[in-house]
Amino acid sequence: QRFAQAQQQLPLESLGWDVAELQLNHTGPQQDPRLYWQGGPALGRSFLHGPELDKGQLRIHRDGIYMVHIQVTLAICSSTTASRHHPTTLAVGICSPASRSISLLRLSFHQGCTIASQRLTPLARGDTLCTNLTGTLLPSRNTDETFFGVQWVRP
Amino acid sequence: QRFAQAQQQLPLESLGWDVAELQLNHTGPQQDPRLYWQGGPALGRSFLHGPELDKGQLRIHRDGIYMVHIQVTLAICSSTTASRHHPTTLAVGICSPASRSISLLRLSFHQGCTIASQRLTPLARGDTLCTNLTGTLLPSRNTDETFFGVQWVRP
Amino acid sequence: QRFAQAQQQLPLESLGWDVAELQLNHTGPQQDPRLYWQGGPALGRSFLHGPELDKGQLRIHRDGIYMVHIQVTLAICSSTTASRHHPTTLAVGICSPASRSISLLRLSFHQGCTIASQRLTPLARGDTLCTNLTGTLLPSRNTDETFFGVQWVRP
């Protein structure tokens, strides 16, 4: 394959293999619906190869189409809790720069305690992704229950 | 990087494109919460390119970051069943080698009969992934309702 | 980018990076359970790089293993609505050519108003994917709530 032959000696980052998987650090103060993320091998199985964290939000370093995925589990939750506090909604979007602000992915917890989804979307260098959790329920910080990641797919 | 150099005229497996999609074979005997998987073109649309099955569990053959995804639908399920049998939980984790044992992905069926999620995670050659379904409910073996797969993403 | 330079001027499509992300255009007439999709930069963040739309259905242009993903949110929906109209089911499948017709992915809305999933599956040039939504509830056309996409993963 000519694609394979063409990859002589380039560092991985230059191959466009930007990828990140984050774990929940904490929720924001009152009136701040954002979730704050953390990543790195010292923290377990989370990592950032290319993208960076800016005050707990994920900043993109390479233009391209990305697969964005997320799972959020509510911490103290049952079917009745979830429906009583309804609607608790999670939205993933570009929050900066302001000129590019847009919601990319939105899900509500109805009678469930976990949401999980993924989508392909174009992102540009400098885009910062925010994950907003509306409502009063707290997300679980267990690393197998709540996580957020991106994977560069193509230019 | 030798990875780049090594790609001259090599078969696809050497490009690091390890990928597998499995269908449910059977559940375990009493006291064994694991799901047992099967894959291969003779079985339909499931396949293994790189990873292997070891007694129905998926074993990784190449180090790297993988996208792991799963969907499980309960066959014996209704909205009331799901909540009455609560909690039925699905967990995907590394079950061997024991030194690397960890839960990677966990979801509960609350009032629903299907869970689906995905995440990025580092896996190493020899890691075996197990999918544990707690509770007594039986998963559907329909290939469009229950499946489990991995995709190598980058070194 | 050096990545681009290293690729000997091959167009991206020849690298096998076929990818598409679609937004909902409209539902079908009575007795037609299919969802009709649209895509393109003029419509927002949807796009088609390789695959094409044929009367609102997605047609594959390159053989290979694909990651197929979907999220559908019901428009006028609450837990009680969802359970009263229960079960509304979404199925993604190959609908043409008829000889390859098969259901790839199926989920029911139980007490929830959103389903989301993904899977790896082999697809061939000319395969057309259809998404059938059974039941009487209407899907949301918000681009962050309902979307459908494919990503070429390997030959």
Epitope: - | H26, P29, A75, C77, R141 | H86, P87
Partner: antibody
């Protein structure tokens, strides 16, 4: 050819116990879940219980939960139903049924049935 | 649980005629997970149709199933003498699986 042969039915007093057996042949027994379905005289068919091919994950109808136990011995290709605390309303023909490969609540082959009569 | 109502309770027809049997569900049946069985006196039920419209192995093509949601139909295009029996529908989309109480197809 798939064959299922039930045995163990008979007359029993309320509160008593009975164990039904179902001998299977003509298919790979351990690969399939198995079920019991019953039919009271002049009544509809009623699902009773199901067990997975490996013998785990037994499930029961609400009407028999806590009283009936389904089990299997794959080495003998035999399915069992242990029925305790029997009631008048448990009187029925009990069918052993092979479960479809993919759908655990759907039955593609049935035995001829064995009659259980609960009466004082 | 999902209640299945079959109609008519009894259907009297002659060999060579067509028969239409109805099964109505109290709520929508998931993924058209509905089957039809035939039972003759003293015999075990025999699977005819699964998934609302797929014929089981060895079932003659005069038997066909249709429907989705809450309304399902079993059609026998030309009745043969051996077709006179009781027919049951069953939903297997949700637990517990439930059966209709049957339609008796008898010779007129």
């Amino acid at each position: 050819e798939v064959q299922l042969l039930e045995s163990g039915g008979g007359l029993v007093q309320p509160g008593g116990s009975l164990r039904l057996s179902c001998a299977a042949s003509g298919f790979t027994f351990s690969s399939y879940a198995m079920s019991w379905v019953r039919q009271a005289p002049g009544k509809c068919l009623e699902w009773v219980s199901v067990i997975s091919g490996s013998g785990g994950r037994p499930n029961y109808a609400e009407s028999v939960k806590g009283r009936f136990t389904i089990s299997r011995d794959n080495s003998k290709n035999t399915l069992y139903l242990q029925m305790n605390s029997l009631r008048d309303e448990d009187t029925a023909v009990y069918y052993c049924a092979k479960v479809d490969y993919s759908n655990y609540l759907f039955f593609d082959y049935w035995g001829q049935g064995t009659l259980v009569t609960v009466s004082s | 649980e999902i209640v299945l109502t079959q109609s008519p309770g009894t259907l009297s027809l002659s060999p060579g005629e067509g028969a239409t049997l109805s099964c109505r569900a109290g709520q929508s049946v998931r993924s058209s997970y509905l089957g039809w069985y035939q039972q003759k006196p003293g015999q075990a039920p025999r699977l005819l149709i699964y998934g609302a419209s797929s014929r089981a192995t060895g079932i003659p093509d005069r038997f066909s199933g249709s429907g989705s949601g809450t309304d399902f139909t079993l059609t026998i295009s030309r009745l043969e003498p051996e077709d006179f029996a009781v027919y049951y529908c069953q939903q297997y989309g949700y637990s517990p699986p439930t059966f209709g109480c049957g339609t008796k197809l008898e010779i007129k």
